[in-house]
Amino acid sequence: AIVFIKQPSSQDALQGRRALLRCEVEAPGPVHVYWLLDGAPVQDTERRFAQGSSLSFAAVDRLQDSGTFQCVARDDVTGEEARSANASFNIKWIEAGPVVLKHPASEAEIQPQTQVTLRCHIDGHPRPTYQWFRDGTPLSDGQSNHTVSSKERNLTLRPAGPEHSGLYSCCAHSAFGQACSSQNFTLSIADESFARVVLAPQDVVVARYEEAMFHCQFSAQPPPSLQWLFEDETPITNRSRPPHLRRATVFANGSLLLTQVRPRNAGIYRCIGQGQRGPPIILEATLHLAEIEDMPLFEPRVFTAGSEERVTCLPPKGLPEPSVWWEHAGVRLPTHGRVYQKGHELVLANIAESDAGVYTCHAANLAGQRRQDVNITVATVPSWLKKPQDSQLEEGKPGYLDCLTQATPKPTVVWYRNQMLISEDSRFEVFKNGTLRINSVEVYDGTWYRCMSSTPAGSIEAQARVQVLEKLKFTPPPQPQQCMEFDKEATVPCSATGREKPTIKWERADGSSLPEWVTDNAGTLHFARVTRDDAGNYTCIASNGPQGQIRAHVQLTVAVFITFKVEPERTTVYQGHTALLQCEAQGDPKPLIQWKGKDRILDPTKLGPRMHIFQNGSLVIHDVAPEDSGRYTCIAGNSCNIKHTEAPLYVVDKPVPEESEGPGSPPPYKMIQTHHHHHH
């Protein structure tokens, strides 16, 4: 049964931030995992995609990610399907909106002493709390004839008088963040002597070295005064400009012009209007310098014909917010069509081969333009140029099987031999074009071969049978030198294979016939009792009709096999004394004797003064030391055979005689009688 180890759980998420719905599955067989949103399968996009079994969100979207997500695991073999618990996001967001007049119905109906209600159209989840401002100053509830209903996001002025005139804005904040009104409301209740806003400066974003204009106008009777201030309260006039505002001009209508704007000019500008009576009106506007960052690189994409795919272009950070559009072959992608742009996404529906190519995402604002290319390849199913053919390959020679296909992208070719994947090694090689080379064909290469050519769009396969044309050869080739033991029975085998079963016969190299006690039985040369005369050169001949004949020459030697006359014994010697290890062997040809001590051959030419090997084969070690202890092996060998025998050598300290021991008391173990070696 399919078991969910980790289930997706409902969670809080922030608009535009990352999120992950976890899902982990355990099942006896392979399962494929997919996700549902409100019962419909979730398609991968760059914004929302499967990450293993889990669903990853690069940027949560309150519209596209609202609903119920479910992780589904399906065993395609059994058809068993398991669904996880439902999970959804509690998406926190905030979105700016305007300040609008709720009551009365139109501005024309606003009169002194009437009730005025303004509504703040900032929305969000969780519901934000609202703060109202008049001319940039926060308004607190219950002061100066106004009430703030946070729940209704309304500001009510009752009754409204000239002192309430001004620019009303609102801000709202919640767990997600903060937003301020996108469009403010100017309330004008006439008291002719009060300064009244006619035109309020707006925040501006300009490119470096461009010009910026702030408009500001007040009206009153008599006319009000107007003054501009920058950031640090520095007044700006045409007579006294601060050093960093040399290129500022204040016009008679109150507008402020800044030319060749530089970074140091960015900041808050205040326009202050003062009537004969009433408070000064301070209006603020910010000058921002336009900027645009670089765009991240796109990975090349491979899509399948007939599918629907999307590529998201995340706009670079910039001010103002850069606009984004996609182009292909120099033409903007349309809003509708089989290939279209929607929001920041390039969408290719029912992909065709002709859709392949370079698509460019452009982003632009006042600061400039950025672009990034994405290379889209439309994968096609491979087609055959040359299928593998049933083939007869010669043993011992290289063999080739073709598998030539074409597709986009270039297909990958794998070969199977008897349903087992062929991994490239010293015998097999797959060329770039898909051809399989068998470097040296062997008999057991005669079997079924299958090649599979694949792209992301699909795969094709074909198989072929290989028949190996066997060489005429000895199996195995007879040893060229062989020994037979004198006066014993002996056999010398010779076998061969070929395309047809070969006939095998032996003959003496000099052409003379085999003696009667020697028989040739289906390739096996049999000596009933080996004599000295049986030594010599013999030839094994294998032949068949189509392939002719082959010959193997064997030199037979008659020998008396080695036996040991004297073998070394287990020996214990006192330190500093001499050890003698005896060894004598006999045989024909006369054997040579070698010694091996402590796992290495003792080379007679490099033994040094302490060791010596006698003519008869015995080994003598003078002035023995503890490190001479160990196994010593006597190896006797001739051209026909080799034999060895071994014995241990123990080197011990000479005991100090005790009172109780008589001078003739025997040692506690068998000692070899040796002479003490005196140093001079």
Epitope: L63, Q64, W325, G330, V331, R332, L333, P334, T335, H336, G337, R338, Y340, K342, G343, V347, A349, N350
Partner: antibody, heavy 120, light 107 residues
Amino acid sequence: QVTLKESGPTLVKPTQTLTLTCTFSGFSLSTSGMGINWIRQPPGKALEWLALIWWDDDKYYNPSLKNRLTITKDTSKNQVVLTMTNMDPVDTATYYCARSLITTAPSDYWGQGTLVTVSS
Amino acid sequence: DIQMTQSPSSLSASVGDRVTITCKASQNVGTAITWYQQRPGKAPKLLIYSASNRYTGVPSRFSGSGSGTDFTLTISNLQPEDLATYFCLQYSDYPLTFGQGTRLEIK
């Protein structure tokens, strides 16, 4: 078959808000690729595109009217609503809703239109 | 915004004639153009999309061509029922914009 029908007031006063409803059948706005446009045509004049809402609630507005327009959908009722604030006599026109199929073309099926007159 | 300039504003032709209406875009719109027919007192009907694709059920005498900035609607073998105003629409970018229309009269 696909049908669309516009409904709303035939007469509105200047400064008032116009609310128009497009009720459709023969397709669903929950189907991927479906959208509804609003288009208007003043008497004897050319067509003017106003707004578009897609199946996934993606909305597009004509920038020249953006501050006055709001488009919403009620998928379960097969309805799309357009509201236009601060109406003016120059807004007198026949208002059409039309279906868009994102993979084909904008406005492949249209309603018969509703004439809205703005007058005091 | 992309401007669509349609010409002529009106034309008169006889049954059986071949009629050509053109639309010029203020910038490259690829093939993102549709043509609509609006009979008197009726809603517009889609004729051509993607500059040259005839919409389902539209008679073969209507054909569209062009790409980039210059587009043409051709009516061959004019019929009495073709009396209507014809509009082009670009959908390369938002806002979608229409041509001013061409009023076609039958002599």
